[in-house]
Interface confidence: low
């Protein structure tokens, strides 16, 4: 049959925590031994691990309150898939059973005295009532016993006297408007209500007592918003160090709204929290050096040749760069003058050609004149030489790449009536003005 | 076991109010938690609100939060849940549900629609724009 199945076993109350779901069946649910399930909501919870026998439960009541009886407790063996000690299966409750005794003997009841005599009448005027008493211990009860009845009883009593009338305040007036809005203020709010002795006045024969108390009261009025403070600006504070140590810089001096705070919705203080100062350090800020661009690569030559253009032999070339701008100590440009590198020379050497596809289209040209143009372009592209692409110049220092340099003759099939270069040309459409992005904004 | 019947479903217009209840039956509603759940068309159910058996932890979904207000009257076995300021996104067949409270633990089934064991059979609201 499906159970509910649940993720924890409270061992102290024996109760399923953590519903996981319904509609499985308990060894599904017991594939983890943490977990507990329940036959039905509400019903019995079982935990999955191997059953043993649960705490006992507390005494029951004793059977009867006083002498000697008798009490239960019980405690079950919860769990799953075998038994508990001595062979019990899980569910199974075992009881025990003890003497008690919550009081040694039982109640026994006692016996009244006779009346005792009338006290006086409980008032001086008009009518009142009087009372007599009786002892319970005729015999005295035993044992936390009593006697039935009531221990005294009370009838009416007449004086013949007329009472007096005495004052008594109506209820009080209202409470006067508050003297102030708000309270913090030179003058303490407060209200005042007032009353009289009216409900009623005090008798004149026989003479009443008059109402007791004042007649008005007073009181600091309550609830009332506490009055605005404005705030108030503090000393400004020590101008701070000038935080550079060349050039322009700039120091700072602050003040706090603290003299007063202002309080329950009193205005800030007006103006600037801080203020600010140039200081100048009369220092010029160092300027690093920065390499310019690298110049042209020298002519690809070999020393003792007079010419290796057109020829499988690798040369050298040489390109350099100047470090500009260095200044007041700066950082000297990073890296080499002089670069070098192997090429093999195809200066002015014919080779063969074969016409490249379209190049993209190029910028509009020009870009703010009339009528700027496109262009693409087919180049006659010489096929390289296929030349060894690493050579070892020196022995033991390994394979170095080698580039081919300078500007051949390539030789392609006319085009279009063209050797070299084909292109095509187009007009640029819907061309905008060029405007000052600056002037624009002004 | 616990049967639930929902009510006070119907059109209406965007920005306006609807209060929905849902009566159970059986001696015992006041052990059970109750929660209301909602199913706009072709899309999956939502959890919309949830109200512990006592009434001191409430739940509710955040698309819904300021404007749906659930409660319950446990001496007129119903739970309510009172829809303000509705709006067209609101429009769905709106589902009440029970379980028992010592199944639970903690908001998160109070959530999820597994955890309810027993379901009433929706009520239509409709927001027109």
């Known amino acids: 049959d499906p159970v509910l199945c649940f993720t924890q076993y409270e061992e102290s109350s024996g109760k399923c925590k953590g519903l996981l779901g319904g509609g499985v069946s308990v060894e599904d649910c017991c594939l983890n031994t943490a977990f507990a399930y329940q036959k039905r909501s509400g019903g019995l919870c079982q935990p999955c691990r191997s059953p043993r026998w649960s705490l006992w439960s507390t005494w029951a009541p004793c059977s009867v309150t006083c002498s000697e009886g008798s009490q239960l407790r019980y405690r079950r063996c919860v769990g799953w898939n075998g038994q508990c000690s001595g062979k019990v299966a899980p569910g199974t409750l075992e009881w025990q059973l003890q003497a008690c005794e919550d009081q040694q003997c039982c109640p026994e009841m006692g016996g009244w005295s006779g009346w005792g005599p009338w006290e006086p009448c409980s008032v001086t005027c008009s009518k009142g009532t009087r009372t007599r008493r009786r002892a319970c211990n005729h015999p005295a009860p035993k044992c936390g016993g009593h006697c039935p009845g009531q221990a005294q009883e009370s009838e009416a009593c007449d004086t013949q006297q007329v009472c007096p009338t005495h004052g008594a305040w109506a209820t009080w007036g209202p409470w006067t408007p508050c003297s102030a809005s708000c309270h913090g203020g030179p003058h303490e709010p407060k209200e005042t209500r007032s009353r009289k002795c009216s409900a009623p006045e005090p008798s004149q024969k026989p003479p009443g007592k008059p109402c007791p108390g004042l007649a008005y009261e007073q009181r600091r009025c309550t609830g009332l918003p506490p009055c605005p403070v404005a705030g108030g600006w503090g000393p400004w504070g020590p101008v701070s160090p000038c935080p550079v140590t060349c050039g322009l810089g700039q120091t700072m001096e602050q003040r706090t709204c603290n003299h007063p705070v202002p309080q329950h919705g009193g205005p800030f203080c007006a103006g600037d929290a801080t203020r600010t100062h140039i200081c100048n350090t009369a220092v010029p800020c160092p300027v690093d050096g920065e390499w310019d661009s690298w110049g042209e690569w020298s002519p690809c030559i070999r020393r003792n040749m007079k010419s290796i253009s057109c020829q499988e032999i690798p040369g050298q070339q040489s390109r350099g760069r100047t470090c500009r701008g260095r200044k007041f100590d700066g950082h000297r440009c990073a890296g080499q003058q002089q670069d070098i590198r192997h090429c093999y020379s195809i200066q002015h050497c014919p080779l063969k050609g074969s016409w490249s596809e379209w190049s993209t289209w190029g910028l509009c040209m020009p870009p703010c004149g009339p009528n700027p143009t496109r262009a693409r372009q087919r180049l006659c592209t010489p096929l390289l030489p296929k030349y060894p692409p690493t050579v070892s110049m020196v022995e033991g220092q390994g394979e170095k790449n080698v580039t081919f340099w300078g500007r051949p003759l390539p030789r392609c099939e006319e085009l279009q009536g063209q050797k070299l270069v084909v292109e095509e040309k187009r007009p640029c459409l819907h061309v905008p003005a060029c405007k000052d992005p600056e002037e624009e904004e002004l | 076991q616990v049967h639930l019947v929902e009510s006070g479903g119907g059109l209406v217009q965007a920005g306006g109010s609807l209060r929905l209840s849902c009566a159970a039956s059986?001696?015992?509603?006041?052990?059970?938690?109750m929660g209301w759940f909602r199913q706009p068309p072709g899309k999956e159910r939502q959890f919309v609100a949830a109200?512990?058996?006592?009434?001191?932890?409430?739940y509710y979904a955040d698309s819904i939060k300021g404007r749906f207000t659930i409660s319950r009257d446990n001496a007129k076995n119903t739970v309510y849940l009172q829809m303000n300021s509705l709006k067209p996104e609101d429009t769905a067949v709106y589902y009440c549900?029970?379980?028992?409270?010592?199944?639970?633990?903690?908001?998160?089934?109070?959530?999820?629609?597994?955890?309810?064991?027993?379901w009433g059979q929706g009520t239509q609201v409709t927001v027109s724009g």
């Open positions: 059986g001696r015992t509603f006041s052990s059970y938690a």
């Open positions: 549900a029970a379980e028992e409270t010592s199944a639970y633990s903690g908001s998160y089934y109070y959530m999820m629609g597994d955890s309810y064991s027993y």
């Open positions: 109200i512990t058996w006592s009434g001191s932890s409430i």
